[in-house]
């Protein structure tokens, strides 16, 4: 028998520094966890104690901070080169800033491989990215080898801007052949490492023949056997047992996200690379364990840039950015329209000839809006601005509903209006109409929705059983500030990017904004 | 003083349908919602459904598929119709008015109720 | 659809007792809660609503408390004409929803 350690990490998100137990900035640093130099200490130990160690990770590193809006991935393969990252999986954030933006800042720089079987390049770009990605990777760990194949999700184009030129085919077609190949290379130990979900890396494990483990990310699952050492809840022991279709019991593993845990796998294989058996559990990062001196006075020294960043001019408003809670939780406010307006415009993809775009959707809690920016200032709007519009740092993210959850998710807007509580949306690419005079829960009189499958956009009247697209806040699809009905029927959801990049992008490429208070919330009395 | 004084057939056969009318007396028809409700034999009490003056309505989920309420203004009636009943919708059924009720408006409740009628369906 | 559980389905009391039936809701519905006293062949009768608002006409003995998913209604002193049964009912979200009832005996 052969025992191989599998230490993974998917979906950090750029959470390079050290954040707090719900993986925003971190406060009270005695109570602060992950980051890459308190990452480094664990697996350097784990290195130490164990001779086959892997360390692997399944996606999304780009996007989430600061750190990515200001290095645009050159931090990525920095610090996992100084990790000694043996393989990753490309996610979807990595194409948020274009196939140029993946190239150059990580697939040129990073000494370890950057795996995926189902991307496949076309036209001038393909001898352009030729080796620089590969579908799967043998790597010599002890006296064996061990096999990695890579997938990511084939709605990258929706949630992403891959380009033209590449071509996200469905990951188990896309990965079959790619096993058969490395079993034809005596390879009989082999990992599927990719960026897909919970439910494809499920399907993977029971549908791929030859898949012996799948460590996966894009879904934030968090895995756990026994009791949970922080607040994430666990949505099945880890590692999650597949039964594949040819009998074989496959090992699913994820690390939940944003580099809180360190997922940590024993597999013992039999001399035929049989999985004999898996045990292990993600490893919180906390205090406990120390950050590495020498790693983290290389985040001290890449620090600094990103102070003088958040204080030069991204662009320039000409009108007050009302986001003050007297507007924002009580009716339109032109705050609510530019965030609104920047999630739109940083989901235009246009991958279908039939639809101006997949998504034209956004709503928004009022709370959220934290600050007005005042335009007396020279007009100069700065990231540190934004920050205090959108201090929590979120995600803007894609999700699936049936007009009939909308409806209800609008009925909650306004269900105790007048509280000025924090439910009251904003919107976007919707008209919506209410009338207080009604009971809570039948105060929508007029819902209307911008239309995708067009050449002009317009309105029309939501449709209670159609699935429609909408960009939100992940507190909102997470259910918060009681949008449980979005958490409950939510059909798909996609997490995006992070919310002050989303409107810092969108103020840097206006240049000059003007946002209006333009009707998109109505009231009408009723005789109620 | 506000009344509710509602009637219709009290024995049907099963794939009949129900039909009953509640009637105001004392009160204004507008600003309120007149609602359905119905209570099985030795059992608790099943929202059914209601209307406003305007004619919108709202309907319990479970029984959307079988469910008509329609209002009258001119005589301040409204009416429940149930289609294809069956044994299960043997029940007393009661009409009732839903106001807004405090100073604020959010909390509403059936502060007016007739005095029910019982259905059976049977074979 | 929000599920309301009342507890206990039923219970014994004297005159002059104190008498607290709970009503759980398995989901947050704020203070959108209502009581009902229903007498036996009679129609049901509104005693509190938002929770803890006593209907104009209702004695006060007869108080409610909570919010969220835990309320309580609470007879201060059980009189002769308070045995009944009493229903809880949501208001919000739609569709209402009532409780099983608690029917209030005399020991």
């Known amino acids: 028998a052969w025992e191989l350690t599998i230490l993974h990490t998917n979906d950090v998100h750029s959470r390079l520094e050290q954040t707090s137990e719900d993986s925003s900035k971190c406060v009270n640093a005695s109570r602060c966890m992950g980051g890459v130099a308190r990452l480094f200490t664990k697996v350097q130990q784990i290195r130490r104690a164990e001779p086959n160690v892997l360390l692997l990770d399944a996606g999304d590193q780009y996007q989430g901070t600061i750190w990515f809006t200001v290095y645009k991935g050159a931090e990525v393969a920095h610090f996992m080169n100084a990790l000694r990252y043996d393989a990753m999986a490309l996610g979807n954030h990595e194409f948020d800033n274009g196939v140029e933006g993946l190239i150059e800042p990580l697939l040129k720089e990073a000494k370890f491989p950057i795996l995926s079987a189902n991307i496949k390049a076309k036209g001038p770009l393909a001898s352009q990215i030729s080796g620089l990605y590969l579908p799967y990777k043998v790597l010599p760990v002890g006296d064996e080898v061990v096999g990695i194949v890579g997938y990511t999700s084939k709605e990258t184009p929706f949630l992403s801007n891959p380009g033209t030129n590449l071509v996200f085919e469905d990951e188990i077609t896309a990965l079959q052949p790619e096993v058969d190949k490395l079993k034809t290379l005596n390879v009989n130990k082999i990992i599927a490492l990719g960026h897909s979900g919970f439910e494809m890396d499920k399907l993977i494990a029971q549908k791929v023949r030859g898949v012996d483990v799948v460590v996966g990310g894009h879904s934030n699952t968090f895995l756990y056997t026994g009791n949970p050492p922080s607040k994430e809840v666990p949505a099945g022991k880890y590692p999650f047992i597949v039964t594949s279709d040819d009998g074989r019991k496959v090992p699913v593993v994820q690390a939940y996200a944003f580099g809180k845990y360190l997922g940590y796998l024993k597999i013992e294989f039999d001399e035929r690379g049989n999985v004999i058996s898996s045990h292990g559990n993600p490893i919180l990062l906390n205090s406990s364990i120390p950050e590495d001196p020498s790693i983290k006075a290389d985040i001290n020294k890449w620090r600094i840039k990103l102070d003088n960043y958040s204080t030069q001019e991204l662009g320039k408003t000409i009108v007050y950015l009302d986001g003050s809670s007297q507007s924002c939780r009580f009716r339109e406010c032109n705050m609510g329209n530019l965030i609104c307006d920047a999630m739109i415009n940083n989901n235009l993809r246009h991958t279908d000839e039939m639809f101006w775009n997949h998504v034209s959707m956004c709503i928004l809690n009022g709370g959220g809006i934290r600050s007005p920016i005042d335009e007396r200032n020279n007009g100069t709007i700065t990231w540190e601005n934004l920050a205090a519009v959108l201090p929590f740092g979120g995600t803007f993210d894609l999700v699936q509903l049936k007009g009939s959850t909308l409806k209800k998710a609008f009925e909650h807007s306004v269900h105790r209006y007048g509280q000025s509580t924090g439910e009251f949306l904003q919107v976007g690419g919707i008209h919506v109409v209410y009338d207080l005079s009604r009971k809570p829960g039948d105060r929508v009189v007029k819902l209307d929705v911008l239309c995708t499958k067009c050449r002009v956009p317009s309105y029309d009247p939501l449709k209670m059983d159609e699935v429609y697209k909408v960009i939100l806040p992940n507190f909102l699809a997470n259910g918060g500030d009681g949008f449980q009905m979005i958490k409950d029927e939510l059909l798909r959801h996609d997490s995006g990017d992070q919310d002050i990049n989303v409107v810092s992008t969108y103020i840097s490429k206006m240049k000059v904004i003007y946002p209006a208070v333009e009707g998109r919330i109505k009231f009408s009395t009723g005789s109620h | 003083q506000v009344q509710l004084q509602q009637w219709g057939a009290g024995l049907l056969k099963p794939s009949e349908t129900l039909s009953l009318t509640c009637a105001v007396y004392?009160?204004?028809?507008?600003?309120?919602?007149w609602s359905w409700i119905r209570q099985p034999p030795g059992k608790g009490l099943e929202w059914i459904g209601e209307?406003?003056?305007?004619?919108?309505?709202n309907y319990n989920p479970s029984l959307k598929s079988r469910v008509t309420i329609s209002v009258d203004t001119s005589k301040n009636q409204f009416s429940l119709k149930l289609s294809s009943v069956t044994a299960a919708d043997t029940a007393v059924y009661y009409c009732?008015?839903?106001?807004?009720?405090?100073?604020?408006?959010?909390?509403?409740?059936?502060?007016?109720w007739g005095q029910g009628t019982t259905v059976t369906v049977s074979s | 659809d929000i599920q309301m559980t009342q507890s206990p389905s039923s219970l014994s009391a004297s005159v002059g007792d104190r008498v607290t039936i709970t009503c759980r809701a398995s989901q947050s519905i704020s203070s959108y809660l209502n009581w009902y006293q229903q007498k036996p062949g009679k129609a049901p009768k509104l005693l509190i609503y938002g929770a803890s608002s006593l209907q104009s006409g209702v004695p006060s003995r007869f108080s409610g408390s909570g919010s969220g998913t835990d309320f309580t209604l609470t007879i201060s002193s059980l009189q002769p004409e308070d045995f009944a049964t009493y229903y809880c009912?949501?208001?919000?979200?739609?569709?209402?929803?009532f409780g099983g009832g608690t029917k209030v005996e005399i020991k």
């Open positions: 004392g009160g204004s028809f507008s600003g309120y919602y």
């Open positions: 209307i406003d003056h305007s004619g919108s309505t």
């Open positions: 009732a008015r839903e106001g807004g009720l405090g100073e604020d408006y959010y909390y509403y409740g059936m502060d007016v």
């Open positions: 009912q949501q208001q919000y979200p739609l569709p209402p929803t």
